[in-house]
């Protein structure tokens, strides 16, 4: 069975060209979207960034693993891009747009 | 695989006295923690509390299924509760926990 | 009271197809995590599968050795829980077990008789 | 070869106590998980007999009791009897897929 790492943030770099996005985002051309992924699993040591729910639900989890899921692996903290696009009536508009950056993961 | 419903908040007590915690906490005897489960899958609706994060993540989990997971059903709102308890030194203690009740569950 | 009963075993050849059925009665079936457990003649008992309750969304499992010839479903309006073997092999011949999951600490605490499956040719 | 690790025989007088050992590993019993116990009398199914390391459904006697220690779980039989004689079962759950895992299974002998 696969075995999982732990908890952490995966860099990834988004191409807007591949969403299809191209013909309204300017720019930029792309960004460094980055991802959660790993286990959230006992013990939730301190780089997991657990919170007091997420050491709860593990707990029940390991005594009652087929009704209680494990927590999940999440973002933590998110950081806002900004993006120049045409808008439906094709004026350039230069907008902030937030949480579209992961920073860090944790277990929730 | 699995075919799971749309994330959302499940209902969950918890008995301290499962958790082997019944000697230190005094009071209460367990909580309604409730945890989050479900899938976050295209198209990421309202209900689902989605960041803008995991909306990209979603259209890219959707080109590269094998690379990048989708993002994860985790709480969105979490409450605290009061836990009367001893401490090292058997003083009783009563401490406000933060982030031990989800409210409310979205994807991320 | 809780019961489990198994039906559908039988003599099948290698390469066949096979359903097994397990009729649940004496509990709210929609609301358990319900397994398939086997037990080759004369071995130890052997994990198959499970299925989930609606609330999560009828999720399935499956052990390596049966991963893409079985299939787990259930029927909550029928209380019945179903196994479909596909493309069967010697090795499979057992007694399967359906077997309830009790919700607070995850035990089997309720098993069906069992039911005998021979693949032979 | 099952995940965890059982002696394939015990065995014991009336009136004695044996222990059933169930060796797992860190992603099984010492990756936190529940460990439970099951009798299967000849001829019958499986029947729980201990849940959580170490608790006893109604109608168990206390005679069974169960236990868990890092990646090791273990079962003891006190005042032994004969319709005690049965294969006994411990099972739990792989961390990685949260899959279930038994163990190989123990023929426990009442002698005499």
């Known amino acids: 069975s696969e075995l999982k790492t732990a908890c952490k943030k995966h860099e990834l770099y988004v191409s807007f060209q591949d969403l299809g996005w191209q013909d309204w985002i300017i720019a930029p051309k792309g960004y460094a979207a980055n991802y959660c992924d790993g286990e959230c699993s006992f013990p939730l040591n301190a780089h997991m960034n657990a919170t007091n729910h997420a050491i709860v639900q593990t707990l029940v989890h390991l005594m009652n693993p087929e009704y209680v899921p494990k927590p999940c692996c999440a973002p933590t903290k998110l950081n806002a891009i900004s993006v120049l696009y045409f808008d439906d009536n094709s004026n350039v508009i230069l907008k902030k747009y937030r949480n579209m950056v992961v920073r860090a993961c944790g277990c929730h | 695989s699995e075919l799971k419903t749309a994330c959302k908040k499940h209902e969950l007590y918890v008995s301290f006295q499962d958790l082997g915690w019944q000697d230190w906490i005094i009071a209460p005897k367990g909580y309604a923690a409730n945890y989050c489960d479900g899938e976050c899958s295209f198209p990421l609706n309202a209900h689902m509390n989605a960041t803008n994060h995991a909306i990209v993540q979603t259209l890219v989990h959707l080109m590269n299924p094998e690379y990048v997971p989708k993002p994860c059903c985790a709480p969105t709102k979490l409450n605290a509760i009061s836990v009367l308890y001893f401490d090292d030194n058997s003083n009783v203690i009563l401490k406000k926990y933060r982030n031990m009740v989800v409210r409310a569950c979205g994807c991320h | 009271q809780v019961q489990l009963v198994e039906s559908g075993g039988g003599l099948v050849k290698p390469g066949g197809s096979l359903r097994l059925s397990c009729a649940a009665s004496?509990?709210?079936?929609?609301?358990?995590?319900v397994h398939w457990v086997r037990q080759a003649p004369g071995k130890g008992l052997e994990w198959v599968g499970r299925?989930?309750?609606?609330?999560?969304?009828?999720?399935?499992s499956y052990a390596a050795p049966v991963k893409g010839r079985f299939t787990i479903s259930r029927d909550d309006s029928k209380n019945t829980l179903y196994l479909q073997m596909n493309s069967l092999k010697t090795e499979d011949t057992a007694v399967y077990y359906c077997?309830?999951?009790?919700?607070?600490?995850?035990?089997?605490?309720?098993w069906g008789q069992g039911t005998l499956v021979t693949v032979s040719s | 070869q099952s995940v965890l690790t059982q002696p394939p025989s015990v065995s014991g007088a009336p009136g004695q106590r044996v222990t059933i050992s169930c060796t797992g590993s860190?992603?099984?019993?010492?990756?936190?998980?529940?460990v439970h116990w099951y009798q299967q009398l000849p001829g019958t199914a499986p029947k729980l007999l201990i849940y959580?390391?170490?608790e006893r459904p109604s109608g168990v006697p206390d005679r069974f009791s169960g236990s868990k220690s890092g990646t090791s779980a273990s079962l003891a039989i006190t005042g032994l009897q004969a319709e005690d004689e049965a294969d006994y079962y411990c099972?739990?759950?792989?961390?990685?897929?949260?899959?279930?895992?038994f163990g190989g299974g123990t023929k426990l002998t009442v002698l005499g």
């Open positions: 077997a309830r999951v009790e919700r607070s600490k995850s035990g089997f605490d309720n």
């Open positions: 004496g509990f709210t079936f929609s609301s358990y995590v």
């Open positions: 299925t989930r309750h609606s609330d999560m969304g009828y999720a399935t």
């Open positions: 860190s992603s099984n019993i010492g990756a936190g998980y529940s």
């Open positions: 959580g390391q170490s």
């Open positions: 099972q739990s759950w792989d961390s990685s897929q949260t899959l279930v895992v």
